[in-house]
Amino acid sequence: RAPRCRELPAQKWWHTGALYRIGDLQAFQGHGAGNLAAPISGLKGRLDYLSSLKVKGLVLGPIHKNQKDDVAQTDLLQIDPNFGSKEDFDSLLQSAKKKSIRVILDLTPNYRGENSWFSTQVDTVATKVKDALEFWLQAGVDGFQVRDIENLKDASSFLAEWQNITKGFSEDRLLIAGTNSSDLQQILSLLESNKDLLLTSSYLSDSGSTGEHTKSLVTQYLNATGNRWCSWSLSQARLLTSFLPAQLLRLYQLMLFTLPGTPVFSYGDEIGLDAAALPGQPMEAPVMLWDESSFPDIPGAVSANMTVKGQSEDPGSLLSLFRRLSDQRSKERSLLHGDFHAFSAGPGLFSYIRHWDQNERFLVVLNFGDVGLSAGLQASDLPASASLPAKADLLLSTQPGREEGSPLELERLKLEPHEGLLLRFPYAA
């Protein structure tokens, strides 16, 4: 008799794929138009692009009125006219809903100022946040983000209160908190009193880019957080290129999309947007490179392969990889909610299996080093439910040159420098 199927876990929308942060709507829109189209309206015109990325939610803003460091001139219920109007926003919400893209609003109060939380007026600000949560939930947003919570006194209790408001409205609403901290104990203390909170942090940003260290960070985090749902990113707001050299971007994309939890990216991560390559651009909000004319000030500074347009036409581009990974992440049960087992594969490598019941299983092998390596996959580390076959089919490699779909012998697996492999194999009873 066939074994009984394992019961599917309850899945919320943020469990089903990536979140995409647009911290600066003006930069995302591009500047050629000046302010002639409100950035919120401009974003509406980019929803088809975002659909093509298969992202499940947009984390927008902040877009509220905030006169730097002036709590009286900070209004979380009003959209700053630099970004558009409430009507523009309502229209965006409706259009996003039609495309099954959720909208999360960043309500970090003093986003233009020195201290995001007006350190001396915490209670006033907390009241404003409560009012804003209720107002924007009624307006139809799907969740909220607050950043820099390490600067918020009594963050845990405030977050618990805000979570209650959010979840009280609907279990389908999400609260994301962001911190600059990379300290696991600090992160755990924020999480312990807020069970459904999604937390973004700098935890992975000091991974030192070695396989062993990354493996140890990931496994420590998963062990410490138990079976709670988590998110994966390198920071609460910044681009991947702020932390990673270009040669590791593909590897990290593969890892973030295949770890158990919600991958969170910033606009431009899908094309390797790098402020440092664009003279004069602010590190925190470089202009999105839609095409070569998106950064017009220095002719020749932007080549086609740095842009959305150029990379869309190249099946070997970072953007094409992002789209493929996002697609896999959103439809394969083992990647959606499968179990995770990391195991030894040799120095410099990080490897793990994702599996769910009798569904197709995935093996990820990542070479963080700058030398080619042979993988010595230690299947003895794995439980019986996640045993390795002799061969697995190559779904994709982060490097060109391999024949996709071909079976690879796992005992003879060799990886190029900075190469990541995503392999698939069937469940065997």
Partner: antibody, heavy 125, light 108 residues
Framework: QVQLVQSGAEVKRPGASVKVSCKAS????????IHWLRQAPGQGLEWMGW????????NYIQKFQGRVTMTRDTSISTAYMDLSRLRSDDTAVFYC??????????????????WGQGTLVTVSS | EIVLTQSPGTLSLSPGERATLSCRAS???????LAWYQQKPGQAPRLLIY???SRATGIPDRFSGSGSGTDFTLTISRLEPEDFAVYYC?????????FGQGTKVEIK
């Protein structure tokens, strides 16, 4: 550096048309809208509208609709402003201009920073 | 459309003096999108201030802008001989973009 160089002065009869050109250099022409403005003798500045050189999309203010046509030729990085059915009160200096992107205090800003030298169009019988 | 009214029409001052120019809007203008320009005879306008208070590249610090809502001010702390010109305010936050009629700063 950014330069917008306009065509020379024109004298036209009432009822005629005039086409003023604006050649851009020092940046990627398709990356910024070109705005057109006019200034009658001894008067203030009046914004007429814009053209997006990338798409060719235009936006004209009500007052000029039906009489103004803005076009571009991306192969030579040049924008054109054509004003038809000229009247004597159209006598003015016409300017093309381009925004500059400034990033200040967390906000991007887009003022008209780069201007052509101006083209005087005299309408006289 | 937003109508901008500048005052005074003419300001007669001596070099070294302080000049205060006013620009009033018929309805609220996002302070992020108010600019001031200087224009000398036979020349194109030159951007001085954008976002109501930020100086454009290369503009000396004797020029400063302030204001919000419907009332904006351009101040020239000490007039230099090259500052005698016509000054325009402009809003570029809502279409159509509009200019004030100008204030002429002349030598007394």
């Amino acid at each position: 550096q950014v330069q917008l160089v306009q065509s020379g002065a024109e004298v036209k009869r009432p009822g005629a048309s005039v086409k003023v050109s604006c050649k851009a250099s020092g940046y990627i022409f398709t990356g910024y809208y070109i705005h057109w403005l006019r200034q009658a003798p001894g008067q203030g500045l009046e914004w007429m509208g814009w053209i997006n050189p990338n798409s060719g999309d235009t936006n004209y203010i009500q007052k000029f609709q039906g009489r103004v046509t803005m076009t571009r030729d991306t192969s030579i990085s040049t924008a054109y402003m054509d004003l038809s059915r000229l009247r004597s009160d159209d006598t003015a200096v016409f300017y093309c201009a381009r925004i500059q992107v400034y990033y200040d205090g967390g906000i991007y800003n887009y003022p008209l920073h780069h201007w052509g030298q101006g083209t005087l169009v005299t309408v006289s019988s | 459309e937003i109508v901008l009214t500048q005052s005074p029409g003419t300001l007669s001052l001596s070099p070294g003096e302080r000049a205060t120019l006013s620009c009033r809007a018929s309805q609220s203008v996002s302070s992020s999108y108010l600019a001031w320009y200087q224009q000398k005879p036979g020349q194109a306008p030159r951007l001085l201030i954008y976002g109501a208070s930020s100086r454009a590249t290369g503009i000396p610090d004797r020029f400063s802008g302030s204001g919000s809502g419907t009332d904006f001010t351009l101040t020239i702390s000490r007039l230099e001989p090259e500052d005698f010109a016509v000054y325009y305010c402009q809003q570029y936050g809502s279409s159509p973009w509009t200019f004030g009629q100008g204030t002429k700063v002349e030598i007394k």
